[in-house]
């Protein structure tokens, strides 16, 4: 079972990304990830989290925003935004430590 080593009870989440095997997945928590790659429109992916919960605590940047929640299909209707572009000297890093 690929999610055997997850902490606590599993939750069912909406799965919307190119790598989803179906409309839902099961994991330790639900995720929404909004990513903007250079020169492209932001992509919003929904899925399940089992590792590195610290990503959920990272602050949004102009390139990425991570959101996590812990209840049944809680990621279904969540919409994220990115931080507005900041001057280079004020840009937050992606490292959340």
């Amino acid at each position: 079972d690929p999610v055997k080593p997850s902490r606590g009870p599993l939750v069912t989440c909406t799965c919307e990304s190119p790598h989803c095997k179906g409309p839902t997945c099961r994991g330790a928590w639900c995720t929404v990830v909004l990513v903007r790659e250079e020169g492209r429109h932001p992509q919003e992916h929904r899925g399940c989290g089992n590792l590195h919960r610290e990503l959920c605590r990272g602050r949004p940047t102009e390139f990425v925003n991570h959101y996590c929640c812990d209840s049944h299909l809680c990621n279904h209707n969540v919409s994220l935004v990115l931080e507005a572009t900041q001057p280079p000297s004020e840009q937050p890093g992606t490292d959340g430590q």
Epitope: P5, H19, H45, L51, E54, T94, G96
Partner: antibody, heavy 118, light 108 residues
């Protein structure tokens, strides 16, 4: 079959920046199930975790190296990279890249020896 | 930061014997994210056990893992010549990821 391959200079001068790239084949670096790690091993010593990157570009680093480390990802090339600045002889090591999943670090590159010397 | 301490540092045994390797954490860790690796000279580490007790793909059933809280064990029930190597435990899945210092399993 997933494969990881490190590449980059085997010799770096002191005070310069070490740069390595890990190319992933047989699987997508953009899958949300995986985290992409760098690990190093000093000659005759144990394993030291350097940091990881997620497909989103979010990174976490070993606190002892954080001030000198940058990890980046290029999903279009299915690659992720390591930069370690201001290197000294103490950074001489075999550097590995590895994929992390719920099943641990399940795939590793073969490792590349980087020597810091003038 | 959690420290993993492996013991013994070196274990000298003969083929056919049973090997018991210990990994102790400085504080309680999730058994879901404790792994064991084998490394031979000149090679990358190879995943043996994840989630404390689940064998990785292709790993023979003579390798088993157990434990909880702060104390974890890798057992090799009957040593084969190819099992003599260095073994590392690891905490993964949250930062900082840490490795034990290793146990060298050598032929007696």
């Amino acid at each position: 079959q997933v494969q990881l391959q490190e590449s980059g200079p085997g010799l770096v001068k002191p005070s310069q920046t070490l740069s390595l790239t890990c190319t992933v084949s047989g699987g997508s670096i953009s899958s949300g199930e995986y985290y992409w790690n760098w690990i190093r091993q000093h000659p005759g010593k144990g394993l030291e975790w350097i940091g990881y990157i997620y497909y989103s570009g979010s990174t976490y680093y070993n606190p002892s190296l954080k001030s000198r480390v940058t990890i980046s990802v290029d999903t279009s090339k299915n690659q992720f990279s390591l930069k370690l600045s201001s290197v000294t002889a103490a950074d001489t090591a075999v550097y590995y890249c590895a994929r992390e999943s719920v099943a641990g670090f399940d795939y590793w590159g073969q490792g590349t020896l980087v020597t810091v010397s003038s | 930061e959690i420290v993993l301490t492996q013991s013994p540092g070196t274990l000298s045994l003969s083929p056919g014997e049973r090997a018991t390797l210990s990994c102790r954490a400085s504080q309680s860790v999730s058994s879901s994210y404790l792994a064991w690796y084998q490394q031979k000279p000149g090679q990358a580490p190879r995943l043996l056990i994840y989630g404390t007790s689940s064998r990785a793909t292709g790993i023979p059933d003579r390798f088993s893992g157990s434990g909880s809280g702060t104390d974890f064990t890798l057992t090799i029930s009957r040593l084969e010549p190819e099992d003599f190597a260095v073994y590392y435990c690891q905490i993964y899945g949250s930062v900082p990821i840490t490795f034990g210092q290793g146990t060298r399993l050598e032929i007696k």
